[in-house]
């Protein structure tokens, strides 16, 4: 992008953001994505239930891949349930997108592959 062509943040791949409700079996991994662009390149931060999401807020913490605009939580547990909001911002503006995570307890002896949608 031309360095003179200043631009507020915008979503670059809304297809990957369509599924807002994630119902995930306990112990699985969940990934939330907010692919974005802008000039200067925006920064991304994450909120849980409207508050800053800190590593110490969950056992094992979480992973953020800035180049992939993603938040990853492994081995989810019921306390991970809630709303997760990505906030993408630069000096020209700010955009956000919220996902809802529900952690499903799968009974023992159920299907090995518990199908759910992202």
């Amino acid at each position: 992008m031309n360095s003179n062509n200043k631009r507020a943040p915008y979503w670059t791949n809304t297809e990957k953001m369509e599924k807002r409700l994630h119902a995930v079996p306990a112990a699985n991994t969940v990934k939330f994505r907010c692919p974005a662009g802008g000039n200067p390149m925006p920064t991304m931060r994450w909120l849980k239930n409207g508050k800053e999401f800190k590593q110490e807020h969950r056992i094992g913490g979480y992973k953020v891949r800035n180049q992939h605009w993603s938040l990853i939580m492994e081995s989810v547990v019921p306390s991970d349930k809630g709303n997760y909001t990505c906030v993408v911002e630069n000096e020209y503006g700010s955009i956000n997108h919220t996902y809802h995570l529900d952690v499903v307890l799968v009974p023992r002896g159920s299907l090995e592959h518990h199908h759910h949608h992202h």
Partner: antibody, heavy 119, light 107 residues
Framework: QVQLLESGGGLVQPGGSLRLSCAAS????????MSWVRQAPGKGLEWVSV????????HYADSVKGRFTISRDNSKNTLYLQMNSLRAEDTAVYYC????????????WGQGTLVTVSS | DIQMTQSPSSLSASVGDRVTITCRAS??????LNWYQQKPGKAPKLLIY???NLQSGVPSRFSGSGSGTDFTLTISSLQPEDFAVYYC?????????FGQGTKVEIK
């Protein structure tokens, strides 16, 4: 054109250390995440580690966690893998690979360097 | 970690055959699935990324489909240069695990 060239492989005793390097050219190195992938003789591919373009994010396979360290020097366009406490099961060809932008698909690979751990 | 299971582990086919390889994930991985081809003594080559996108320069006889837990790599008409080992790889979780591979041999 994109090129990745690994070096630093060789024979090392169990418990020893080795540092692999991957020299990159033909692209803006700091814009891309890089990974190491290994392949034991006659076996399948095993992902080892990844590092983000600016070095801010790293992750490791459980099999190497605490023993291997991935790093990069963007001023030298070079990726590294420091391997400590080496075991016989670490014997493999080690490949460095570039991730596609916005996807963790490895679109370019080096030719590989062989690491042999044996007494 | 997320486990990837490929089937079959090997298959024999003839030039011109339609070949299908499947990959199953131990949990939903959305469309975060790549396919690679590897020939003896060579580095792997990316064929398909994000389940269904053909990598630049890869012949159109290769295609990928699926999402969630079940994925397929199809070679519509097998060519002599396609005899190789094929691997799937997930990149949904931080550890980008590969399937065990499928060897495509000449019948």
């Amino acid at each position: 054109q994109v090129q990745l060239l690994e070096s630093g492989g060789g024979l090392v005793q169990p418990g020893g250390s080795l540092r692999l390097s991957c020299a990159a050219s033909g692209f803006t190195f700091s814009d891309y995440a890089m990974s190491w992938v290994r392949q034991a003789p006659g076996k399948g591919l095993e992902w080892v580690s990844v590092i983000e373009g600016d070095g801010s994010y790293t992750h490791y396979a459980d099999s190497v966690k605490g023993r291997f360290t991935i790093s990069r020097d963007n001023s030298k366009n070079t990726l590294y893998l420091q391997m400590n406490s080496l075991r016989a099961e670490d014997t493999a060809v080690y490949y460095c690979a570039r991730e596609k932008t916005y996807s963790s698909a490895f679109d370019y690979w080096g030719q590989g360097t062989l690491v042999t751990v044996s007494s | 970690d997320i486990q990837m299971t490929q089937s079959p582990s090997s298959l024999s086919a003839s030039v011109g055959d339609r070949v299908t390889i499947t990959c199953r994930a131990s949990q939903d991985i959305s469309s975060d699935l790549n396919w690679y081809q590897q020939k003896p003594g060579k580095a792997p080559k990316l064929l398909i990324y994000d389940a269904s996108n053909l990598q630049s320069g890869v012949p159109s006889r290769f295609s990928g489909s699926g999402s969630g837990t079940d994925f397929t790599l199809t070679i519509s008409s097998l060519q002599p240069e396609d005899f190789a080992v094929y691997y799937c790889q997930q990149h949904y979780s931080p550890s980008h695990t590969f399937g065990q591979g499928t060897k495509v041999e000449i019948k």
